[in-house]
C-alpha cells in the first residue's frame, strides 16, 4: 500500500493525523469497528494538545475514544501504553460505576461535556471520533 | 509487571482486630477498582469486599457488613481492610484482586482466628 | 443475591480428554462472568471473562459460553497441569458470588 499523504474527504488534519466526527451515536464496539473499516481507530488521546483539538472540534458532547478496559487493564485501541501516557480522568473517575442497573460496570471511555474523561456502560450510544495517521501506509494500492 | 502483594495476616484472638494490607505495582493504581476476596480453609471463594478508583464506591458482603472497612491510599499504591469483631468463622487466606472479575491477584495472607 | 451453582461438582477425567463443567445463576446475569482456576496452596487464575473472552496468556484448549443464566467450561486435551478446582463468579452485580467450584482430578 502507499504511504497516505493527505487526509480523506470529510477528515480533518491535525499534527500529522486526520480526524474524522461523528454527528450521530453508536455503541463503542461499534463505532470501534466503524473506524477500522475506514482503515482508522477511534481517537488515542497522547497530549494535552491533541486533547484540546478534539475538544473543540465535538463540543459539549458525550464521544467515545479509542480507551477501554474491557479486558481487565485499560488499553488504547492502537497499542499506546495507557500506564504511561496522557490522562484526563474527571475526579473521582474511572469509577466503574454499577448503580446504572444495567448489568456489570463501566469498561469505556468517553469524553465529557467539559472534555474531561469518564468510564461509561460501553452499550451507550455516543458520538464517536475516528483517528488515523498520515505517516500510516494505506490499504488502498498505489495509482500507476 | 503488574504485582499485589497482601501482608498484615496472623492469629487473633475472637473479638479482636488486624488490618491487612495490600502492595500494589506495574499499574495505575487509581483507576482500578479493587477487591478483597477470601477462602476458608478446604472451602471455596468468597467475595468480601470492593472499593472504586476514588474511593467513590465501596461495597460489603453481609457477612462482613459493620466489622469490615475496606480503603485505599492511591498515593501509597495500597489498599486495606479493618477487620474489628473477627469470629471463627472469618478465618481464611485473604486475597486481593484487582478490577471486579479479579484479573490478577495477590498470594493471600492468612488470618485466624481462634481462642 | 445471585446465586450460582456449579455441576459437576467433582469428576474424575484421564489426560487428553475434553471435560465440561456448567454453571447457571439464579437470575440473569448477561455475559457478566469469569472462570477461575486455582491449584491447592495457590491464588486463582482468571481464565475466561465476558462468558467467553480467553485471558491474556491463557491457552486456547480453555472455552467458555454462554449467556444470561447458563454457562459452560470446555477443556479440551486435559494434560496434568489442568487437575485443579475451577469457580465460576458472576460480576454483573453486587454482591459478586462465586459458584461452589467443580474439581477436576485424575481417573
Known amino acids: 500500500g502507499s504511504e497516505r499523504t493527505c487526509c480523506p474527504v470529510n477528515w480533518v488534519e491535525h499534527e500529522r493525523s486526520c480526524y474524522w466526527f461523528s454527528r450521530s451515536g453508536k455503541a463503542w464496539a461499534d463505532a470501534d469497528n466503524y473506524c477500522r473499516l475506514e482503515d482508522a481507530h477511534l481517537v488515542v488521546v497522547t497530549s494535552w494538545e491533541e486533547q484540546k483539538f478534539v475538544q473543540h472540534h465535538i463540543g459539549p458532547v458525550n464521544t467515545w475514544m479509542g480507551l477501554h478496559d474491557q479486558n481487565g487493564p485499560w488499553k488504547w485501541v492502537d497499542g499506546t501504553d495507557y500506564e504511561t501516557g496522557f490522562k484526563n480522568w474527571r475526579p473521582e473517575q474511572p469509577d466503574d460505576w454499577y448503580g446504572h442497573g444495567l448489568g456489570g460496570g463501566e469498561d469505556c471511555a468517553h469524553f465529557t461535556d467539559d472534555g474531561r474523561w469518564n468510564d461509561d456502560v460501553c452499550q451507550r450510544p455516543y458520538r464517536w471520533v475516528c483517528e488515523t495517521e498520515l505517516d500510516k501506509a494505506s490499504q488502498e494500492p498505489p495509482l500507476l | 509487571e503488574v504485582q499485589l502483594v497482601e501482608s498484615g495476616g496472623g492469629l487473633v484472638k475472637p473479638g479482636g482486630s488486624l488490618r491487612l494490607s495490600c502492595a500494589a505495582s506495574g499499574f495505575t493504581f487509581s483507576s482500578y477498582t479493587m477487591n478483597w476476596v477470601r477462602q476458608a480453609p478446604g472451602k471455596g471463594l468468597e467475595w468480601v469486599s470492593s472499593i472504586s478508583g476514588s474511593s467513590s464506591y465501596i461495597y460489603y458482603a453481609d457477612s462482613v457488613k459493620g466489622r469490615f472497612t475496606i480503603s485505599r491510599d492511591n498515593a501509597k499504591n495500597s489498599l486495606y481492610l479493618q477487620m474489628n469483631s473477627l469470629r471463627a468463622e472469618d478465618t481464611a487466606v485473604y486475597y486481593c484482586?484487582?478490577?471486579?472479575?479479579?484479573?490478577?491477584w495477590g498470594q493471600g495472607t492468612l488470618v485466624t482466628v481462634s481462642s | 443475591d445471585i446465586q450460582m451453582t456449579q455441576s459437576p461438582s467433582s469428576l474424575s477425567a484421564s489426560v487428553g480428554d475434553r471435560v465440561t463443567i456448567t454453571c447457571r445463576a439464579s437470575q440473569g446475569i448477561s455475559k457478566y462472568l469469569v472462570w477461575f482456576q486455582q491449584k491447592p496452596g495457590k491464588a486463582p487464575k482468571s481464565l475466561i471473562y465476558a462468558a467467553s473472552s480467553l485471558q491474556s496468556g491463557v491457552p486456547s484448549k480453555f472455552s467458555g459460553s454462554g449467556s444470561g443464566t447458563d454457562f459452560t467450561l470446555t477443556i479440551s486435551n486435559l494434560q496434568p497441569e489442568d487437575f485443579a478446582t475451577y469457580y465460576c463468579?458472576?460480576?454483573?452485580?453486587?454482591?459478586?458470588?462465586f459458584g461452589p467450584g467443580t474439581k477436576v482430578d485424575i481417573k
Open positions: 484482586a484487582r478490577v471486579s472479575w479479579a484479573d490478577c
Open positions: 463468579q458472576q460480576y454483573n452485580s453486587y454482591p459478586f458470588t
